[in-house]
């Protein structure tokens, strides 16, 4: 296993609709054809997997149908979008990138993006 640098923004504020997007960029040492991207959430020293996708270079990322993540890739950058976020989902979202094929296997883990989320104000009841 060889180490690889992964960069991601330090802080992102989710939209009022609970959507946060950020770019995860990795310094690919070679010509990988198969890449796996995993988003981990760290909150109060507990780490959980949010979503993961394996893709072939040049193709779209495919997350599971029920995943809260979507993404696109361009070269050594992955643009990740996480939706359905609530205030309780505030935390550090870490991008983990694995170059699966061809060998050698490379692993890179970013420092994390702190995503802040605020629940939208409830709409006042309207009289119709």
């Amino acid at each position: 296993c060889k180490a690889m640098h992964v960069a991601q923004p330090a802080v992102v504020l989710a939209s009022s609709r609970g959507i946060a997007s950020f770019v995860c960029e990795y310094a690919s040492p070679g010509k990988a054809t198969e890449v796996r991207v995993t988003v981990l959430r760290q909150a109060d020293s507990q780490v959980t997997e949010v979503c993961a996708a394996t893709y072939m270079m040049g193709n779209e990322l495919t997350f599971l149908d029920d995943s809260i993540c979507t993404g696109t890739s361009s070269g050594n950058q992955v643009n990740l979008t996480i939706q359905g976020l609530r205030a309780m989902d505030t935390g550090l979202y870490i991008c983990k990138v694995e170059l699966m094929y061809p060998p050698p296997y490379y692993l890179g883990i970013g420092n994390g993006t702190q995503i802040y989320v605020i629940d939208p104000e409830p709409c006042p009841d309207s009289d119709f």
Partner: antibody, heavy 117, light 107 residues
Framework: QVQLVQSGPEVKKPGASVKVSCKAS????????IGWVRQAPGQGLEWMGW????????NYVQKFQGRVTMTTDTSTNTAYMELRSPRSDDTAVYYC??????????WGQGTLVTVSS | EIVLTQSPDFQSVTPKEKVTITCRAS??????LHWYQQKPDQSPKLLIK???QSFSGVPSRFSGSGSGTDFTLTINSLEAEDAATYYC?????????FGPGTKVDIK
Amino acid sequence: QVQLVQSGPEVKKPGASVKVSCKASGYTFTSYGIGWVRQAPGQGLEWMGWISAYNGNTNYVQKFQGRVTMTTDTSTNTAYMELRSPRSDDTAVYYCARVGSSGVDYWGQGTLVTVSS
Amino acid sequence: EIVLTQSPDFQSVTPKEKVTITCRASQSIGSSLHWYQQKPDQSPKLLIKYASQSFSGVPSRFSGSGSGTDFTLTINSLEAEDAATYYCHQSSSLPFTFGPGTKVDIK
């Protein structure tokens, strides 16, 4: 090293908008946020809200909602805070501060805004 | 919003004495509590992040502890230059909030 340099003192009449700038250097501007904090004379620190320089999203404290606008210019690494319809009780030192994963870490030198007729 | 309370409001201390300042949150904030020092006519400076992690360049006499709702800032062997107001700050949830501050002066 991280530096936040704010614009100079302002004297405004009640109702006349004020806009404070905050120029950042020494780090990747779009990777962080910029928060705004004010401190009335002899008082404590009051959080006003912040803007994510990465995507431009903002979060304002309710009491300032509708009266404050926070923006960034990523081409010049500068953040702005505009306060509309200021009153005499808005007289304070206004600080910008970098928002990182550990809340606020670096602060500007402060800008004294005096609202007086 | 999360309300932070600090105690004491004011403390007058002799040099070399130990100072303890507490900060209590209105609900659990994990370890997302940070401490700042503000001297007269200066900007606040970060001392301790995430309850117990020293920020770069901060003297070792400053330390922090706690998690959940109760936190403590300790200044071991106070020096004259430590005369300042100390604020706690939470970044657990929006909107961020500050404690009211604790003023420490030298006897």
